[in-house]
């Protein structure tokens, strides 16, 4: 479990980046004397910051354009689906059930006719 | 507690089959139900089951051409594609902990 | 995986001891996810022992099961006529498929 543990922090990161982006959209038009867009814009980076660092298999000093970085999250995604698509392991029967009937078969009652040889 | 497995016939190769296991005095819908035939003069060999919550799993080489379901609390069916000489066999079914074996139903494949 | 049984035929002597192994490729479920069947011809197979070394209700006590992982042992005490059969190990395991997979069968011949 612990290979899927950057999974919930990525979804962070995700939702991070797509709540900054719909602020950002919906900011259009506003005042641009206002702020708010670059603070968005300072919050967009650190998600992508942080979307570097979740993704598995970039090195740490690597340097990736945010569409790198979303491609990368992109293929790790696809990877994962992957991943859970494959049928999980299961058991090779359920708990061991009792026959109610207990009766002893013809062929396992112990013989009494103990014979030196067989036929 | 019983099982029976009723469908087994003489078909000729490439002719699919259903064979049904039957259950008596239990439901099968909490149970896992196996199927494992023998060829004639040959050892054991097993199918696949069908787990109380109607998982299906299989045995690698019967994947494809066998699907095992559940059709009622009471009947398991198990369906064979693309039959060949080389299924001929009794099949049996079993019942969860392979306590309670049917009495089999031979299947013969022959052109 | 593949369960691989001492080879056939295995003679014993009325009122003998006669022992019958099988190994395991892989260790099966639990370590002791192993069951022992008899079957004679015409017949189905008949559960002995369950988990490595439970006895099925109304198995004699001197049937034994015993091992762990991926060695097993059926041992057969005070041998009678009426276990002339053959001897299946059947092994589980966790997997995706191939859950369940039987020895090749030991033919025990009492004498």
């Known amino acids: 479990m612990k290979a899927l543990s950057p999974v919930r922090g990525c979804y962070e990161a995700v939702c991070c980046l797509s709540e900054r982006s719909l602020a950002i959209a919906r900011g259009r038009g506003k005042s641009p004397s206002t702020e708010e867009p670059l603070s968005l814009l300072d919050d967009m980076n650190h998600c992508y910051s942080r979307l570097r660092e979740l993704v598995p298999g970039v090195p740490r000093g690597t340097q990736l354009s945010q569409v790198e970085i979303l491609q990368r999250v992109i293929d790790y995604i696809l990877d994962l689906q992957v991943v859970l698509a494959e049928p999980a392991p299961g058991p090779p029967d359920g708990p061991h059930l009792p026959i109610q009937t207990a009766e002893l078969t013809p062929e396992l009652v112990i013989s009494k006719d103990k014979r030196s040889f067989c036929h | 507690q019983s099982v029976e497995e009723s469908g087994g016939r003489l078909v000729t190769p490439g002719t699919p089959l259903t064979l049904t296991c039957t259950a008596s005095?239990?439901?099968?819908?909490?149970?896992?139900i196996h199927w494992v035939r023998q060829a004639p003069g040959k050892g054991l060999e097993w199918i696949g089951y069908?787990?109380?919550?109607?998982?299906a799993r299989y045995a690698t080489w019967a994947k494809g051409r066998f699907t095992i379901s559940k059709t009622s609390s009471t009947t398991v069916n198990l369906k064979m594609t693309s039959l060949t000489t080389e299924d001929t066999a009794t099949y049996f079914c079993?019942?969860?902990?392979?306590?309670?074996w049917g009495p089999g139903t031979l299947v013969t494949v022959s052109l | 995986a593949v369960l691989t049984q001492t080879p056939s035929p295995v003679s014993a002597a009325v009122g003998g001891t006669v022992s019958i192994s099988c190994q395991s490729s892989?260790?099966?479920?639990?370590?002791?996810?192993l069951s022992w069947f008899q079957q004679k011809p015409g017949q189905p197979p008949k559960l002995l022992i369950y988990?490595?070394?439970k006895l099925e209700s109304g198995v004699p006590s001197r049937f034994k099961g015993s091992g762990s992982g991926t060695q097993f042992t059926l041992t057969i005490s005070d041998v009678q006529c009426d276990d002339a059969a053959t001897y299946y190990c059947?092994?589980?395991?966790?997997?995706?498929?191939?859950?369940?997979?039987f020895g090749g069968g030991t033919e025990v011949v009492v004498k």
């Open positions: 892989q260790s099966v479920w639990n370590n002791n996810w």
């Open positions: 069908i787990s109380d919550g109607d998982t």
């Open positions: 079993a019942r969860q902990g392979f306590n309670i």
């Open positions: 005095g239990f439901s099968l819908s909490n149970v896992y």
């Open positions: 988990e490595t070394s």
């Open positions: 059947l092994g589980g395991y966790w997997t995706t498929s191939d859950n369940n997979v």
